[in-house]
Interface confidence: medium
């Protein structure tokens, strides 16, 4: 897998550490497939940023499917203590708020938010899942918190 050594950093809300997507398939929606077996599997939920249980039908589906909770965590998360937190002391917007939206070069498109310096608003855009820049937030609230006046 050519993505084996790549880490895709995504800025997340201030309650949680930044999300690092190791593979773009971690952003896929849980897919039980068309078959009717009842198999307990795990998938990575980009909204809760946690590995969660789902029932897999036994065929097809996608790569966001793991035999164990541990495997899911290993493939889709890596904690990092560095956070971007807007404090009362930090009155100025960080420089990255003025960067243009950048989808990056990957193709695992997921929805993110960026601060649009033209409209002075946080807006939605498609993020490819890797590279790009720090003007990239998982939640609208965090984008507003950090970059809007």
């Amino acid at each position: 897998d050519s993505e084996e050594d790549e880490e895709h950093t995504i800025i997340t809300d201030t309650e949680l550490p930044p999300l690092k997507l190791m593979h773009s398939f971690c952003a896929f929606k849980a897919d039980d497939g068309p078959c009717k077996a009842i198999m307990k599997r795990f998938f990575f939920n980009i909204f809760t940023r946690q590995c969660e249980e789902f029932i897999y039908g036994g065929c097809e589906g996608n790569q966001n499917r793991f035999e164990s909770l541990e495997e899911c965590k290993k493939m889709c998360t890596r904690d990092n203590a560095n956070r971007i937190i807007k404090t009362t002391l930090q009155q100025e917007k960080p420089d990255f708020c003025f960067l243009e939206e950048d989808p990056g070069i990957c193709r695992g498109y997921i929805t993110r938010y960026f601060y649009n310096n033209q409209t002075k608003q946080c807006e939605r855009f498609k993020y490819g899942g890797c590279l790009g820049n720090m003007n990239n937030f998982e939640t609208l609230e965090e984008c507003k918190n950090i970059c809007e006046d």
Partner: antibody, heavy 119, light 107 residues
């Protein structure tokens, strides 16, 4: 089956307000944002904004900021759009619409509510 | 805002013909383009999203293509029921924007 049910036509006076409901069924209401789209007679479609029913967070097209207010009632799985300070320019069909999971097109639309602003 | 331009307001075609409706974005929208069909008195109907992914139940005669700023909806063999307005829409970034529409008329 996903259904978005809108109310019937509204005839309102200039300067007044109107609140349009959109009742969702056939899916978990809080799992998807609800979008609103305007279509003036014989014209194209304009995205007004959307609201995340799980937390009430909304994004507006700046053209409609101050004109439209989006709200939800989770208990009845209903989204609302209030339009205020109405003028003849606001005469249009207003649709609620729901996207796919990852914000990739609108497969589900309400039937539209015609709002006519006239003295 | 991203401007979506459909240069042809009207297109005339015959049943069985192949027709292509074009749409140009004012910036690269990384294939985040949807196409809709709208008939009089009806809500728009999603045909294509991600530029080329056909929505469930859409006839195979509808195909989408394109990348960067240029996108095309092709109807391989036009049927009488395809008489309608067709809109493109970018779902790359908010505010989502639609093209002005192309009305397909059957000769």
């Amino acid at each position: 089956e996903v259904l978005l049910q809108q109310s019937g036509p509204e005839l309102v006076k200039p300067g007044s307000s109107v609140k349009i409901p959109c009742k969702a069924s056939g899916y978990t209401f809080t799992d998807y944002t609800m979008d609103w789209v305007k279509q003036s007679h014989g014209k194209s479609l304009e995205w007004i904004g959307d609201i995340n029913p799980s937390n009430g967070g909304s994004i507006y097209n700046r053209k409609f900021k101050g004109k439209a207010t989006l709200t939800v009632d989770k208990s009845s799985s209903t989204a609302y759009m209030e339009l205020r300070s109405l003028t003849s320019e606001d005469t249009a069909v207003y649709y609620c619409a729901r996207m796919h999971y990852n914000y990739d097109g609108f497969p589900y639309w309400g039937q539209g509510t015609l709002v006519t602003v006239s003295a | 805002d991203i401007v979506m331009t459909q240069s042809h307001k009207f297109m005339s075609t015959s049943v069985g013909d192949r027709v292509s409706i074009t749409c140009k974005a004012s910036q690269d929208v990384i294939t985040a383009v949807a196409w809709y069909q709208q008939k009089p008195g009806q809500s728009p109907k999603l045909l294509i999203y991600w530029a080329s992914t056909r929505h469930t139940g859409v006839p195979v005669r509808f195909t989408g293509s394109g990348s960067g700023t240029d996108y095309t909806l092709t109807i391989i063999s036009v049927q009488a029921e395809d008489l309608a307005l067709y809109y493109c829409q970018q779902h790359y970034s908010t505010p989502y924007t639609f093209g002005g529409g192309t009305k397909l008329e059957i000769k």
